[in-house]
């Protein structure tokens, strides 16, 4: 009986072994097939051959003090994705802004030549004819147009004729509004920061919002105007003129924006000089916004050559006056504050000059001259508090002009002389103009470039005009790098585990099965 019993148990064991091995074999086979398919699918979708079709775009920023040409590049197949456009070149045109050519329009063609030729070199010849070129003029031309629509139109007409001579697809030159300048700057920085990309979990199709998706506000400072743009907490606005609605990548944004014409750093300085010379007792202006020992002669006719100084205009008993620097930050700050009329506000809250400003919300990117000036002063670090910035400005402005010239020998004196004023003006504008505080100062990030692209309105302008920002979220969201790595590792592990179990099953002695039964 014992032998029979042993035989029966051996048979049972053999049957179990056969049954288990068949099932396990099926499971392992199925698992490995799934893992291989998954690896191939993830690998192929993520690493499909890069599209050869690269597109280019050119935007000229015709600012009040100079013109810059930007060249952008992106893969054609991905033009509706977020963050795929990047800047490949910036060319600064030699000379002043185009509005200064009003009396010499015939020189505009030569003025633009170098940078347009540079674009010809950078962009492959085969792409020239399909590369759009846009020129946007900002506050310098807005001021010229205030003087005469014809004069502004004549300048743009010559610009258009000059740009049409190049082999690119010229799309026109126009004066953009202050609202557009603010809005496109906001779009640019949020596009580059990836704020419009609604990331999807690898196991879910539903986009989820994270705190990271809160957009940044945009602070732009030019020579003739300054813009503030952000999404306020309260969606209802007291001032419809300052409200913009966008639908970008499937999400609605209610944006506040305002452009302060005449409050760019150059025009603000002209305003301050025109204001201060009114009370000067003679043709010497002792100016706290310039370094001690600094001297410069200013023509009264130049002072009144801008619409921005009209409110301070008066007959002076001299044709010229001399600025004599005394380098006092506190006095300079006080003088600058007089440019902001804060006594009148027809809303619940204003910035200055009776312009509505909702409570500040979130982080802000401060770019263009905000960045250039603060970067020169070495004050762009996130760790530098507002109090520290003020201390540094006090120290900088009080430094003698001769010392400053020696310390910054490579910098043009015209620019070097104005950093004390510009830094003071930036602090005054942000703190008293826009109501940032010592606490909210840490929410201001001084930004020059984001992933190699300049922060500014030009990228946003091109994205809009080339219809590269869809209203709705594109259907297929590509995997993020981390999700891709996770999936590749996961399915590779599955394959490895399957292989190990397979080896164990088919290469282990019979006691392995005994233990299992």
């Amino acid at each position: 009986m014992k032998g029979t019993k042993d035989l029966t148990s051996q048979q049972k064991e053999s049957n179990v072994k056969t049954f288990c091995s068949k099932n396990i074999l099926a499971i392992l086979g199925f698992s490995s097939i799934i893992a291989v398919i998954a690896l191939l699918a993830v690998g192929l979708t993520q690493n499909k051959a890069l599209p050869e079709n690269i597109k280019y775009g050119i935007v000229l920023d015709a600012g009040s003090s100079h013109t810059s040409l930007y060249i952008y590049k992106w893969p054609a197949e991905k033009e509706n994705d977020t963050g795929v456009v990047h800047q490949v070149e910036e060319c600064r045109v030699k000379g002043p802004g185009i509005s200064k050519y009003v009396q010499k329009v015939n020189e505009i063609g030569i003025y633009l030549t170098d940078c347009m030729e540079r674009a010809r070199e950078v962009i492959p010849r085969s792409q020239h004819q399909e590369t759009p070129v846009y020129l946007g003029a900002t506050a310098g031309m807005r001021l010229l147009r205030m003087e005469s629509e014809e004069l502004a139109d004549r300048v743009l007409d010559v610009v258009e004729r000059s740009l049409s001579n190049y082999p690119f697809d010229f799309q026109g030159a126009r004066i953009i509004t202050g609202q557009e300048e603010g809005a496109y700057g906001w779009i640019t920085i949020n596009y580059l920061l990836g704020k419009f990309s609604q990331k999807t979990r690898w196991f879910s199709i539903v986009p989820y919002e994270t705190n990271n998706q809160e957009t940044f506000g945009a602070l732009d400072l030019g020579g003739a105007s300054t813009q503030i743009t952000f999404v306020p907490q309260n969606q209802t606005t007291e001032s419809p003129d300052n409200a913009l609605q966008f639908r970008l990548y499937g999400k609605d944004y209610n944006v506040y924006t305002h452009s302060f014409l005449c409050y760019g750093k150059d025009q603000a300085l002209w305003q301050k000089l025109a204001k201060d010379i009114q009370v000067a007792s003679n043709e010497i202006l002792r100016d706290p916004c310039f370094h001690p020992g600094y001297k410069k002669v200013v023509n009264v006719s130049d002072l009144y050559k801008t619409p921005c100084t009209k409110r301070f205009e008066m007959t002076l008993p001299f044709q010229q006056f001399e600025i004599q620097g005394i380098g006092n930050y506190q006095q300079c700050h006080q003088s600058v504050l007089e440019l902001f009329n804060t006594s009148y506000c027809p809303y619940s809250q204003c910035a200055f000059n009776g312009i509505f400003l909702p409570p500040l919300q979130g982080d802000f990117g401060a770019f263009s001259a905000f960045y250039f000036v603060m970067n020169f002063l070495n004050l762009t670090s996130e760790k530098v508090s507002q109090e520290k910035v003020t201390e540094m400005m006090k120290k900088f402005c009080s430094q003698p002009w001769e010392e400053i010239k020696t310390s910054y020998a490579g910098v043009k004196e015209k620019y070097l002389s104005e950093y004390c004023f510009s830094g003071t003006y930036i602090l005054s504008l942000l703190l008293q103009g826009y109501h940032f505080t010592a606490d909210s100062w840490e929410h201001i990030h001084f930004i020059g470039k984001i992933q190699g692209s300049d922060a500014g309105w030009t990228l946003g302008y091109m994205l809009n005009l080339t219809n590269m920002i869809p209203a709705e979220q594109p259907l297929s969201t590509p995997l993020s790098h981390s999700t891709y790595v996770f999936l590749m590792v996961l399915f590779s592990l599955v394959l490895v585990i399957v292989a190990i179990i397979g080896l164990l099953i088919f290469h282990k002695p019979s006691y392995f099965w005994k233990d299992m039964v």
Epitope: Q103, M146, E147, S148, E149, E150, L151, K305, P307, K310
Partner: antibody, heavy 123, light 105 residues
Framework: EVQLVESGGGLVQPGRSLKLSCLAS????????MNWIRQAPGKGLEWVAS????????SYADTVKGRFTISRENAKNTLYLQMTSLRSEDTALYYC????????????????WGQGVMVTVSS | DTVLTQSPALAVSPGERVSISCRAS??????MHWYQQKPGQQPKLLIY???NLASGVPARFSGSGSGTDFTLTIDPVEADDTATYFC????????FGAGTKLELK
């Protein structure tokens, strides 16, 4: 009410100089471009010189370039035309004229004209 | 210089419609303006930027055109409209047409 009153005209010998003045009232003078336009007896209108509101653009007709100088004193609401090396062909009625505006933008058309001042260049 | 050409004279009866033309030697966009001058008076602005009626000007006056060809229309003409009409361009430094003398029959 917008008013432009010219003065300083008269009879002058060829080669001599004369300075015309125009006193403006009834509007914010420094917000507007100003011009001198002349009309020879029995003839058409000829633009002479322009001075934009913020002096960004000062321009002259080829016939007077180098001889005439336009200027303005905003605090005194006054426009001037300094005429030198006068010729017989400069004989005309000289109008002080204000630039118009297209909404918020300046325009090179002429919306208000003074009565004119006569300049006669003769020996 | 941009030369503006006008027909020298026109004679119409009161109540009729009259069109005064002005042709520019080169395109001036819409920067064409019209003035009326009566004997012994300074010119008076009628139309600015091709088609905009100046303030205080009767709606009988209208302007049209762009580029090189422009028209001032008076409909209907009244006895008081006897005057010389000048066109002026401002695309380049200002120039005037020689004027069209409108007489009533």
């Amino acid at each position: 009410e917008v008013q432009l009153v010219e003065s300083g005209g008269g009879l002058v010998q060829p080669g001599r100089s004369l300075k015309l003045s125009c006193l403006a009232s009834g509007f914010t003078f420094n917000n507007y471009g100003m011009n001198w336009i002349r009309q020879a007896p029995g003839k058409g209108l000829e633009w002479v010189a322009s001075f934009s509101s913020s002096s960004t653009y000062i321009s002259y007709a080829d016939t007077v370039k180098g001889r005439f100088t336009i200027s303005r004193e905003n605090a005194k609401n006054t426009l001037y035309l300094q005429m030198t090396s006068l010729r017989s062909e400069d004989t005309a009625l000289y109008y002080c004229v204000r630039h118009g505006r297209y909404g918020g933008y300046g325009g090179f058309y002429f919306d208000y004209w003074g009565q004119g001042v006569m300049v006669t260049v003769s020996s | 210089d941009t030369v503006l050409t006008q027909s020298p004279a026109l004679a119409v009866s009161p109540g009729e419609r009259v069109s005064i033309s002005c042709r520019a030697s080169e395109g001036v966009k819409s920067y064409m303006h019209w003035y009326q001058q009566k004997p012994g008076q300074q010119p008076k602005l009628l139309i600015y930027k091709a088609s905009n009626l100046a303030s205080g000007v009767p709606a009988r006056f209208s302007g049209s055109g762009s580029g090189t060809d422009f028209t001032l229309t008076i409909d209907p003409v009244e006895a008081d409209d006897t005057a010389t009409y000048f066109c002026q361009q401002s695309w380049n430094d200002p120039t005037f047409g020689a004027g069209t003398k409108l007489e009533l029959k």
